[in-house]
């Protein structure tokens, strides 16, 4: 299975986090845990996070790493679009954005990534084990889809990591290659979690000589001196299925875009917008299949030109995204 995971950024230690969460050996398990719950193609990454302050609020971020220009993005939940999933938002680079409850705000973050905020309560509220999928249609190559969900538990005593369901269009090489990596990773995760459970976590000062440091850096390329992992996930162990939304779905021809205001698509256009402005660092992505450990602030080697952020009226801090350094 081809797998793409958005890795939480390493953060400076926070008060109260020097214990188990501050323990360096937990960096790798958390990264592996994220890998175990996000599946798709190496062209697309999906990150799902729940706001710790509002347990009913989710942020889904998706990005496209493939070649070509994006012609349409569809975000769905409950499974891949067209395979039982329910459409939450459709983003078109020129015609604008359309969204359906409980989607609150869908927007382009860069030329090749989007974010969607979900909130709600009751039947249409998302829950922790919901699968969210992003499908990017690119020109001329066509569609790529990947799905992700929240880790089912942030408890260090997690009994077993989940197994991601295969995503459409994952080729045999991808399945074999990444299955091996995931199997090794998940087994190693269990081993570390069990070992950690049976001994108290020492309060370690950040140390460059820690034997876990190189591995932590390999999986989550950030500053080596940063010791604690700030996990941006709150979890709830409920089991639910998204309700069928009683709103219109986009189908047919282009006519359903007609009611959109002309300013709806906040996406830089034209060759100038594709200049060499780099993406600000937003944590890191891991492409298992490609063996690629690249900082999000660097241009992935197989993408096209550099990417440009949209201007945001709330100022530069607003553009940092869920994984920005706070």
């Amino acid at each position: 299975m081809r797998t793409e995971a958005q890795v939480p950024a390493l953060q400076p230690p926070e008060p109260g986090l020097e214990g188990a969460m501050g323990h360096r050996t937990l960096v790798l398990p958390w990264v592996l845990l994220t890998l175990c719950v996000t599946a798709g193609t190496p062209e697309v990454w999906v990150q799902v996070r729940m706001e710790a302050t509002e347990l009913s609020s989710f942020t889904i971020r998706c990005g496209f790493l493939g070649s070509g220009s994006i012609s349409l993005v569809t975000v769905s939940w409950g499974g891949p679009n067209g395979a039982g999933g329910t459409t939450l938002a459709v983003l078109h680079p020129e015609r604008g954005i359309r969204q359906w409850a409980p989607a609150r705000q869908a927007r382009w973050e860069t030329q090749s990534s989007i974010s969607l905020i979900l909130e709600g309560s009751g039947a249409s509220s998302p829950c922790a084990n919901t699968t969210f999928c992003c499908k990017f249609a690119s020109f001329p190559e066509g569609s790529w889809e990947a799905c992700g969900s929240l880790p089912p538990s942030s408890d260090p005593g997690l009994s077993a990591p989940p197994t991601p369901a295969p995503i459409l269009r994952a080729d045999l090489a991808g399945i074999l290659g990444v299955s091996g990596v995931l199997l090794f990773g998940c087994v190693y995760l269990l081993h570390l979690l069990r070992r950690h459970k049976h001994r108290p976590a020492p309060r370690l000062q950040p140390s460059r000589t820690s034997p876990q440091a190189p591995r932590a850096r390999a999986w989550a390329p950030s500053q080596a001196s940063q010791a604690a992992l700030h996990v941006p996930y709150a979890t709830i162990n409920t089991s639910c299925r998204p309700a069928t939304l009683d709103t219109a779905h986009p189908h047919g021809g282009p006519s359903w875009w007609a009611s959109l205001p002309t300013h709806a698509a906040h996406r830089p256009q034209g060759p100038a917008a594709w200049a060499s402005t780099p993406i600000p660092a937003r944590g890191s992505f891991v492409s298992v299949e490609n063996g690629l450990y690249a900082q999000a602030g660097e241009r992935p080697p197989h993408t096209g030109p550099g990417l440009t952020l949209f201007p945001d009226p709330r100022g530069p801090r607003a553009m940092e995204g869920p994984l920005g350094v706070r």
Epitope: S67, H92, A137, F139, P140, E141, S143, D171, P250, H302
Partner: antibody
Amino acid sequence: QVQLQQSGTILARPGASVKMSCRASDYTFTDYWIQWIKQRPGQGLEWIGAIFPENGDTRYTQKFKGRATLTADKSSSTAYMQVNSLTSEDSAVYYCATFINYVDYWGQGTTLTVSS
Amino acid sequence: QIVLIQSPAIMSASPGEKVTMTCSASSSVNNIHWYQQKSGTSPKRWIYDTTKLTSGVPARFSGSGSGTSYSLTISSMEAEDAATYYCQQWNINPYTFGGGTKLEIK
């Protein structure tokens, strides 16, 4: 196996219009662009345009904009190209093609002969 | 529009010989794609994104280049490689093809 089946040979008069088809099978038709490419006898390839069946998005080369019209029928997984105001310069083989995750699939080509 | 000039227009090579053909763009492009076409058949994309081989293409083929200069190389010519090769850019509409290089076997 992915297949693109194109309509057969077409003979047309100068000034007339023709509509050729490209029927897709064994993949999700709506998810991938259908490209149209022209090849005159003994010559190179020329991109005409493309359509994204999911929402009807089209892209054309300026040379064919206004004279070629691309459409797609999702119910029959068929893409169409209509060319108006034919001249002898339009005599060529017209291919439809699609790229599915970096693998390309081509129709066998429709031969259009424009002659009075 | 971006004009792609392929050279040579025609070339021949003996089995086992190394073959290199070039594609020169009138202005810079991010990537070049190469297509193989044999007489009487539809083209097939052979190399995409400058260097990546389409599934099923023999490893003796390789692509390289950047900016305005690109090339396709066959490390060891085989009879089945005799065909016409076209380069193409998906960078700027119109998405142009080169005029082709016809490769013959000696």
